[in-house]
């Protein structure tokens, strides 16, 4: 996160860290807890690393430096990448992770509400992006979970800023004209959440941007409302019933 500040304990209890353990262990992506056994993240996090057993998912944490060999983590039972995601495109950058064991909810570890299907009418004015990603383009992973308040921009405006890419209706963009605040490398898969009528909702999944926090280059997020049918279908068909936070 560029231009952000430290988060507090329990402030974003749905935020998880997706880490890979090969020879060393490192944070690669963020994700959002949406049910006892489900995490929503970006499909591109798994490019080149599709093996379930190399991943460790840490929930209910604030500081990555607090993680030791004794820190509990979740393992992956199943990775469900959107069937239309292609490595040659930037579309459908969404994936579900089914955890091997359900998580208990606590003050520091609980799910985020999902939006209603095809939610286009709600005007979100209080949106935040969180993650442990770089604090500048050529930076490094941060220890303390960062947060930043960023306004949504219209898809029309976003398309003007990204003429060489196709900004679809299944994407949502956020950023300041002058730049300075944005997600960055390592924040991928994490949440863009907006507070509406006193309730936090998962509006976007951190996907991509041209650099980080550059002027007139907003961040681009997968629009969760556009994938509600897919999320419900995959979580229900796998569980028999949807064990996740119901759409708001």
């Amino acid at each position: 996160i560029v231009g952000g500040t430290n988060s507090s304990w329990g402030e974003w209890p749905w935020q998880v860290s997706l880490q890979v353990k090969l020879t060393a262990q490192r944070h690669l992506c963020g994700g959002s807890l949406i049910g006892h056994q489900w995490v929503l993240t970006a499909a591109h996090c798994f490019d080149g690393l599709p093996l379930q057993d190399v991943w460790r998912i840490y929930s209910g944490i604030l500081n990555l430096s607090d993680i030791t060999k004794d820190t509990p983590f979740s393992q992956i039972k199943e990775i469900i990448i959107h069937q239309n995601y292609k490595v040659s495109e930037g579309n459908h950058d969404i994936a579900l992770i089914k955890l091997q064991a359900p998580l208990n909810y606590t003050e520091f570890q609980k799910p985020i509400c999902l939006p209603s299907k095809g939610d286009t009418s709600t005007i979100y004015t209080n949106c935040w992006v969180t993650g442990w990603g770089f604090s500048k383009e050529k930076g490094e992973i941060q220890n303390i979970l960062q947060k930043v308040n960023i306004p949504l921009v219209t898809n029309e405006e976003c398309q003007k800023r990204y003429q060489d890419y196709k900004i679809t209706q299944r994407m949502v963009c956020a950023g300041y004209k002058e730049g300075g605040k944005d997600a960055c490398k390592g924040d991928s898969g994490g949440p863009l959440v907006c507070k509406h009528n006193g309730m936090w909702r998962l509006v976007g999944i951190t996907s991509w941007g041209e650099g980080c926090a550059r002027r007139e280059q907003p961040g681009v997020y997968t629009k969760v409302a556009e994938y509600m049918d897919w999320i419900l279908e995959k979580t229900q068909s796998s569980d028999g019933k949807a064990q996740m936070q119901s759409p708001a």
Epitope: G90, D187, S188, E210
Partner: antibody, heavy 125, light 108 residues
């Protein structure tokens, strides 16, 4: 299956014009950046031009700027290259190609992932 | 413009040998925009590696790419008969997009 089929090449005199077409199929054409790359006989690859998915943004190599125009018709899944004021040094096989733009670590990637078989343009008197 | 310099110009190797091809750029190139292509006579180029190190769909794992900044490498761990041809590196980090002059891999 992705297919790119160029047409319109041939022999033309210096100063003449030619219009190349590229019919695309097997993918959502309107979502992709498209490009033309050429290769003079026995030489290496040279990028010519690209066009944004909507067609609203075009970039050219200095060697063709002001003479060549790239365009597209997304309703017909077709890419074009209008070549005017042709010179002997424009003699080459012209490839129509698709630009893949994936995502890696919150950035986009870019590479030319699908190529047509090429059409030969010969500029000679 | 970003100049791409490939070396060697020609590489003469036997099947089963390891091939190491170099690509140097005149300016910093974002790795996400560095690709390698293979071309055999009379054929269109074929994408091998994108993002400096990711194999394109269907490309065997004997092909690998590494590098950062201005120095990139394509390695073919064990040459197969179908690997002979000309290899090009290319950057699309900045316009104009540029290709290297190519490295020809020939049978020894």
């Amino acid at each position: 299956e992705v297919q790119l089929l160029e047409s319109g090449g041939g022999l033309v005199q210096p100063g003449g014009s030619l219009r190349l077409s590229c019919a695309a199929s097997g993918f959502t054409f309107s979502h992709y950046l498209m490009t033309w790359v050429r290769q003079a006989p026995g030489k290496g690859l040279e990028w010519v031009s690209y066009i944004s998915p909507s067609g609203g943004h075009t970039i050219y190599a200095d060697s063709v700027k002001g003479r060549f125009t790239i365009s597209r018709d997304n309703s017909k899944n077709t890419l074009y290259l209008q070549m005017n004021s042709l010179r002997a040094e424009d003699t080459a096989v012209y490839y129509c190609a698709r630009v893949a733009q994936g995502i890696a670590a919150r950035s986009r990637t870019s590479s030319v992932d699908q190529w047509g078989q090429g059409t030969l343009v010969t500029v000679s008197s | 413009d970003i100049q791409m310099t490939q070396s060697p110009g020609t590489l003469s190797l036997s099947p089963g040998e390891r091939a190491t091809l170099s690509c140097r750029t005149s300016q910093f190139v974002n790795s996400n925009y560095l690709a390698w292509y293979q071309q055999t006579p009379g054929q269109a180029p074929r994408l091998l590696i994108y993002g400096a190190s990711s194999r394109a769909t269907g490309i065997p794992d004997r092909f690998s790419g590494t590098g950062y900044g201005t120095d990139f490498t394509l390695t073919i761990s064990r040459l197969e008969p179908e690997d002979y041809g000309t290899y090009y590196c290319q950057q699309s980090s900045r316009t104009p997009w540029t290709f290297g002059q190519g490295t020809r891999v020939e049978i020894k």
